[in-house]
């Protein structure tokens, strides 16, 4: 029960991760004009990974795309990358966490399959996370780079008669979300594997049981459960939810109209 | 049609305080920001502050910070510019005029003459 | 604040001459965000308040007749009349749209020569 909880909780926080890390991608607000100690701006400038906006107090908003690939900064360009590759990824960890679920019955899929499954997806939203919270610092890193520089520039050349209103940028709202995002993806994906963990020796023990089935020892009871006896910490009952999932060793000791895990 | 109509003028004593009021019909009053402009006598244009009638939220020229006032009424459409602690210098036409593209103004009232004098 | 210095104060021309009016910028009024100016003009007659005729420095206001056109970039712009007309004799404004608070240049007196 708590194998298949780590297990649902781990899918859930990196479907939410995921989720964010997209919205992210997509959000213009990455970086958002330094207002310092100006609160209220005649002229509003943010921008994205994919377009740079302007809002002007007089509400008007407009977007533009950066329609050029070759003149791109090389870091926007990694940053994009390393936010499509964590999109892929999750997406992918996703579609695999699905089938690996416990709690879903796909035609007769051993608990060693879904191990294996579970582990893959959740190394899957490890890797996603890590690429969200690299892309985010990457993206981050050279903001704080180029606000110093352009704090530099302001007191810089002042001499003269016109003075050029350098604008500077902060941490736009996308940064964090994109932070929360890839940490909550980074951290489902460790409950995947721990869950992977969890599912691997109950998988070993049924495997036991079935092995060693072909002896007197195991007692078919009524309403769809089986008891084992003398087989170490295996000797609780266990009710049947999988309608047809079993082993090699099950289906070649019990050619039975029930069936059992 | 959209109009501005403004209050009529006004004759104050110096230190007393002056409210003008700004109707406005023919488009969603609470859509566009409202601003405050002054003209004294062979002056400049001169941007007092602005009022956002959806929010309430202001902004003042530091200059008449501590002295202006702008408040708005949805229900009436109407703003509102009180200047307070008046000095012979504020003798001017005060105009409301709407905000709109390119930060310009491209609706005035007819404005309204505020004279100071002992 | 920025400071908007119009130049001539006053300018007499021949109806259907060309005027031109120049405001310069203490500050550049390029936005890098749209690689727009935000500098507007406005035209003012007697008794009457302002009315809008360019903004972005060269966008002209529907119902603007198109003898009116704005230019220029950073800090320096102009006005042009390209061919007087008798109801043109104004007043005539240019404003900084960029930056709180909103200044305007002292203005420049239009006359028919």
């Known amino acids: 029960m708590a194998v298949t909880a780590c297990q649902g909780l781990g899918f859930v926080v990196s479907l939410i991760g995921i989720a964010g890390i997209i919205a992210a991608t997509c959000m213009d607000q990455w970086s958002t004009q330094d207002l310092y100690n100006n609160p209220v701006t005649a002229v509003f400038n943010y921008q994205g990974l994919w377009r740079s906006c302007v809002r002007e107090s007089s509400g008007f908003t407009e977007c533009r795309g950066y329609f050029t690939l070759l003149g791109l900064p090389a870091m926007l360009q990694a940053v994009r990358a390393l936010m499509i590759v964590g999109i892929v990824l999750g997406a992918i960890g996703l579609l695999v966490s699905i089938f690996a679920l416990k709690c879903i019955r796909i035609g007769s899929m051993e608990d060693s399959a879904k191990a294996n499954m579970t582990l893959t997806s959740g190394i899957m939203f490890i890797v996603s996370g890590l690429c969200a919270i690299a892309g985010v610092s990457v993206f981050a890193n050279m903001l704080v780079t180029n606000f110093w520089m352009s704090t530099a520039n302001m007191y810089t050349g002042m001499g003269g008669m016109v003075q050029t209103v350098q604008t500077r940028y902060t941490f736009g709202a996308a940064l964090f979300v994109g932070w929360v995002a890839g940490g909550l993806t980074l951290i489902g994906g460790v409950m995947m594997c721990i869950a992977c963990r969890g599912l691997a020796p109950e998988e070993t023990n049924y495997k036991a049981v079935s092995y060693h089935a072909s002896g007197h020892s195991v007692a078919y009871k009524p309403g769809g459960f089986k008891a084992s006896t003398g087989f170490g910490s295996n000797t609780k009952n266990k009710k049947i939810y999988d309608g047809g999932a079993r082993t090699e060793d099950e289906v070649q000791s019990y050619p039975s109209k029930h069936d059992y895990v | 049609e959209v109009q501005l109509v403004q209050s009529g003028a006004e004759v104050k004593k110096p230190g007393a305080s002056v409210k003008v009021s700004c109707k406005a019909s023919?488009?969603?009053?609470?859509?566009?920001?409202m601003h405050w402009v002054r003209q004294a006598p062979g002056q400049r244009l001169e941007w007092m502050g602005m009022?956002?009638?959806?929010?309430?939220?202001?902004n003042y020229n530091e200059k008449f910070k501590g002295r202006v006032t702008i408040t708005r009424d949805t229900s009436a459409s109407t703003a509102y510019m009180e200047l307070s602690s008046l000095r012979s210098e504020d003798t001017a036409v005060y105009y409301c005029?709407?905000?709109?593209?390119?930060?310009?103004?491209?609706?005035w009232g007819q404005g309204t003459t505020v004279t100071v004098s002992s | 604040d920025i400071v908007l210095t119009q130049s001539p104060d006053s300018l007499a021309v021949s109806l259907g001459e060309r005027a031109t009016i120049n405001c310069k910028s203490s500050?550049?009024?390029?936005?890098?965000?749209?690689?727009?100016?935000?500098l507007t003009w406005y035209q003012q007659k007697p008794g009457q308040p302002p009315k809008l005729l360019i903004y972005?420095?060269?966008t002209r206001e529907s119902g603007v007749p198109d003898r009116f056109s704005g230019s220029g970039s950073g800090t320096d712009f102009t006005l042009t009349i390209s061919s007087l007309q008798a109801e043109d004799v104004a007043v005539y404004y240019c404003?900084?749209?960029?930056?709180?608070?909103?200044?305007f240049g002292q203005g420049t007196k239009l006359e028919i020569k």
């Open positions: 009022i956002h009638p959806n929010s309430g939220s202001t």
């Open positions: 972005w420095a060269s």
């Open positions: 500050q550049s009024l390029l936005n890098s965000g749209n690689q727009k100016n935000y």
């Open positions: 404003q900084n749209a960029y930056t709180y608070p909103f200044t």
């Open positions: 005029a709407r905000l709109k593209t390119g930060n310009s103004f491209d609706y």
């Open positions: 023919g488009y969603t009053f609470t859509s566009y920001w």
